[in-house]
Interface confidence: medium
């Protein structure tokens, strides 16, 4: 099942997704789409990066982290109940037969009477840990393995549970990290 993240109406939601570029500036294209990752590309694309920059985005969707270092986590500004659903982060690794795909479930809760700070997120789950294995996981799952075609030395998922979402550094630990090179 999808990894689940929560936010309140009016807050900014955060959906983590990471990879490690093989070298500085050697970026991998990424697309974010609303809906589960399809077989090809992203459905209902809301944001896309190429090897240099963010080359497509829609209002309220942006990358708050340093995508040039592989932090392609999606921020959705001022969320409403309509933003609930599955989002696809697709890391479009060239030169292999399949991309890496992550389905993340965003649950929007009604605003509390006393609104929480807009930067605070409530994470309810994180990606399961999996060590590298020969070959890579099925396209529809979040379990990943090694991709020797691109000299991928490590694909790992970190943090079974994100315990303190108030610390910015902890945000990185909640996502899938792909290390290339």
């Amino acid at each position: 099942s999808e990894v689940e993240y929560r936010a309140e109406v009016g807050q900014n939601a955060y959906l983590p997704c990471f990879y490690t570029p093989a070298a500085p500036g050697n970026l991998v294209p990424v697309c974010w789409g609303k809906g589960a990752c399809p077989v090809f590309e992203c459905g209902n694309v809301v944001l896309r990066t190429d090897e240099r920059d963010v080359n497509y985005w829609t209002s309220r969707y942006w990358l708050n982290g340093d995508f040039r270092k592989g932090d392609v986590s999606l921020t959705i500004e001022n969320v409403t109940l309509a933003d609930s659903g599955i989002y696809c982060c697709r890391i479009q690794i060239p030169g292999i037969m399949n991309d890496e795909k992550f389905n993340l479930k965003l649950v929007i809760k009604p605003a509390k009477v006393t609104p929480a700070p807009t930067r605070q997120r409530d994470f309810t789950a994180a990606f399961p840990r999996m060590l590298t294995t020969r070959g890579h996981g099925p396209a529809e799952t979040q379990t990943l393995g090694s991709l020797p075609d691109i000299n991928l030395t490590q694909i790992s998922t970190l943090a079974n549970e994100l315990r303190d979402s108030r610390l910015a550094n902890d945000l990185r630990d909640s996502g899938a990290t792909i290390r290339i090179g």
């Epitope: 090809f40 590309e41 694309v45 529809e140």
Partner: antibody, heavy 115, light 110 residues
Framework: QVQLVESGGGLVKPGGSLRLSCAAS????????MNWVRQAPGKGLEWVSS????????YYADSVKGRFTISRDNAKNSLYLQMNSLRAEDTAVYYC????????WGQGTTVTVSS | QPVLTQPPSASGTPGQRVTISCSGS????????VYWYQQLPGTAPKLLTH???QRPSGVPDRFSGSKSGTSASLAISGLRSEQEADYYC???????????FGGGTKLTVL
């Protein structure tokens, strides 16, 4: 190395059926999406169908919808295309191609639909 | 009728640079990546360029892809006789939920 070998082509009458197979080797078949693409004699490439690694997602070209069925058996490292209600315009070389980027192609199998 | 539009033929002399165009729409070329395939006579298609116009291993750097808006192109430099082949562009169409191909361009080395 990665290899795809198609089989099952042949001569069939209009309205008949054929089942094409694609045997995969040299890679973890169960991890990859797979595709069928065809090429009519003297014509260009035409995508036919795609299936995701665990068969959760399946797509068909409008020209074959309702007549062709794509499937796979990951235990046997095999991809299939069941073709029913065949028409003359289905005459083509059928290729299987692997992955999200259709990187690797088989050598093709010829399907001829003629009375 | 192919969804992507390519010129039916192109030609050049040995050593020359030739460019093949591929025109689509916002739902395919404009949104998604364009792939180029080479099909030598009597053989299966072979992937030449893919994501970010990069080449798979074994494909010489004489082949380079590019894209601008809803149009893409394949440039072949240092033309050789063994590059006489049909060249196809392809992209995933988000609206059709289908792979779409160009009609193919037959390259002749004069």
């Amino acid at each position: 190395q990665v290899q795809l070998v198609e089989s099952g082509g042949g001569l069939v009458k209009p309205g008949g059926s054929l089942r094409l197979s694609c045997a995969a080797s040299g890679f973890t078949f169960s991890s990859y999406s797979m595709n069928w693409v065809r090429q009519a004699p003297g014509k260009g490439l035409e995508w036919v169908s795609s299936i995701s690694s665990s068969s959760s997602y399946i797509y068909y070209a409008d020209s074959v919808k309702g007549r062709f069925t794509i499937s796979r058996d990951n235990a046997k490292n095999s991809l299939y295309l069941q073709m029913n209600s065949l028409r003359a315009e289905d005459t083509a070389v059928y290729y299987c191609a692997s992955g999200d980027h259709m990187d690797v192609w088989g050598q093709g199998t010829t399907v001829t639909v003629s009375s | 009728q192919p969804v992507l539009t390519q010129p039916p033929s192109a030609s050049g002399t040995p050593g020359q640079r030739v460019t093949i165009s591929c025109s689509g729409s916002s739902s395919n070329v404009g949104t998604n990546y364009v792939y180029w395939y080479q099909q030598l006579p009597g053989t299966a298609p072979k992937l030449l360029t893919h994501i970010n116009n990069q080449r798979p291993s074994g494909v010489p750097d004489r082949f380079s892809g590019s894209k601008s808006g809803t149009s893409a192109s394949l440039a072949i430099s240092g033309l050789r006789s063994e590059q006489e082949a049909d060249y196809y562009c392809a992209a995933w169409d988000a609206t059709l939920s289908a792979w779409v191909f160009g009609g193919g361009t037959k390259l002749t080395v004069l």
